[in-house]
Interface confidence: medium
Amino acid sequence: EVEKTACPSGKKAREIDESLIFYKKWELEACVDAALLATQMDRVNAIPFTYEQLDVLKHKLDELYPQGYPESVIQHLGYLFLKMSPEDIRKWNVTSLETLKALLEVNKGHEMSPQVATLIDRFVKGRGQLDKDTLDTLTAFYPGYLCSLSPEELSSVPPSSIWAVRPQDLDTCDPRQLDVLYPKARLAFQNMNGSEYFVKIQSFLGGAPTEDLKALSQQNVSMDLATFMKLRTDAVLPLTVAEVQKLLGPHVEGLKAEERHRPVRDWILRQRQDDLDTLGLGLQGGIPNGYLVLDLSMQEALS
């Protein structure tokens, strides 16, 4: 807390300008009117205040707006945003995408801080859903943003927003997140033709069920091994050797290099060795000829 002291004669600030950088902390407290500061916040960013001086300016705004800053002030916080705590930010009502962009710009190049996470949370809650423009903005600043959301939060993403998602935005998503995103992507891209559709849906396929993989295998998509390795194991297991061959096309040769890794390893164990041999890749570990294959999942469903 800064002690309340009278402003020295002639030092009362008439506007927010560079002369204030020479003010001591107590002089800033005594001589800068909080209402003046609020109306000229856009100037603060252009003045090289020290962090200590910024603390004083923040304190003045906190006193003026104990219930939280208005958006007209928030939009022009600039580097003062770095002084805010998540508790401060929880009091805000941020509705303008321009405000969000301005504050994200301040934090650009840094990891997502608790302040930024709180800001985004407040913004998205205020909007009611994660619309395309917001998603565009957030993934531009934080490519991993989408995968930081819970499946519950992702459920509020409208299918139209999926157009804003780039493959790298999904790099760190787990199967539960793709579970929610895949059907939205399918809905968003369904009017595209076969090859264009596959290019768009490819990064979401970690949420695809077996039936969709079977359908894709009929469409000459030539899925690469990196995508195949990200598919859900339970979705891959029921695929036949012929279906996997059609799904991968020329990339089928890559199975050999991945034969010890999931889902390839588990898939091999479910295939007849004779069928695997037709691929000519030397894949080993299939069911020997003459053995009976029991579908245990069907048995469990019936019991």
Epitope: P159, D179, P183, Q190, G207, P209, E211, A215, R232
Partner: nanobody, 121 residues
Framework: QLQLQESGPGLVKPSETLSLTCTVS?????????WGWIRQPPGKGLEWIGS???????YYNPSLKSRVTISVDTSKNQFSLKLSSVTAADTAVYYC??????????????WGQGTLVTVSS
């Protein structure tokens, strides 16, 4: 073309459990990607309640999570919603929703026509 129809009591007493069923016709419920519930309180926007996915995973709105259960009965071509400890704030039009098309090349999101549930003693 899937058709969805909500059914259940239109009036529920405070602190009781709201139970709604959604009956699916025009196709098999097991060919859907997900089944979900959404509500709209009078004069307010839509609020997602929760969804159950093809994989069996269930996701609920965090603000309702402790009170919600969604389940699917494929043998009856139905899915249901249970919301416990209701208050007047749970008064809303409740919609069931589903997305069809597992294994198909086109897909669509279907909604029921909605049913008004009033919580009052």
């Amino acid at each position: 073309q899937l058709q969805l129809q909500e059914s259940g009591p239109g009036l529920v007493k405070p602190s009781e459990t709201l139970s709604l069923t959604c009956t699916v016709s025009g196709g098999s419920i097991s060919s859907s990607y997900y089944w979900g519930w959404i509500r709209q309180p009078p004069g307010k926007g839509l609020e997602w309640i929760g969804s159950i996915y093809h994989s069996g995973n269930t996701y609920y709105n965090p603000s309702l999570k402790s009170r919600v259960t969604i389940s699917v009965d494929t043998s009856k071509n139905q899915f249901s919603l249970k919301l416990s400890s209701v208050t007047a704030a749970d008064t809303a039009v409740y919609y069931c929703t589903s997305q069809d098309g597992v294994g198909a090349t086109t897909t669509e999101e279907y909604w029921g026509q909605g049913t008004l549930v009033t919580v009052s003693s």
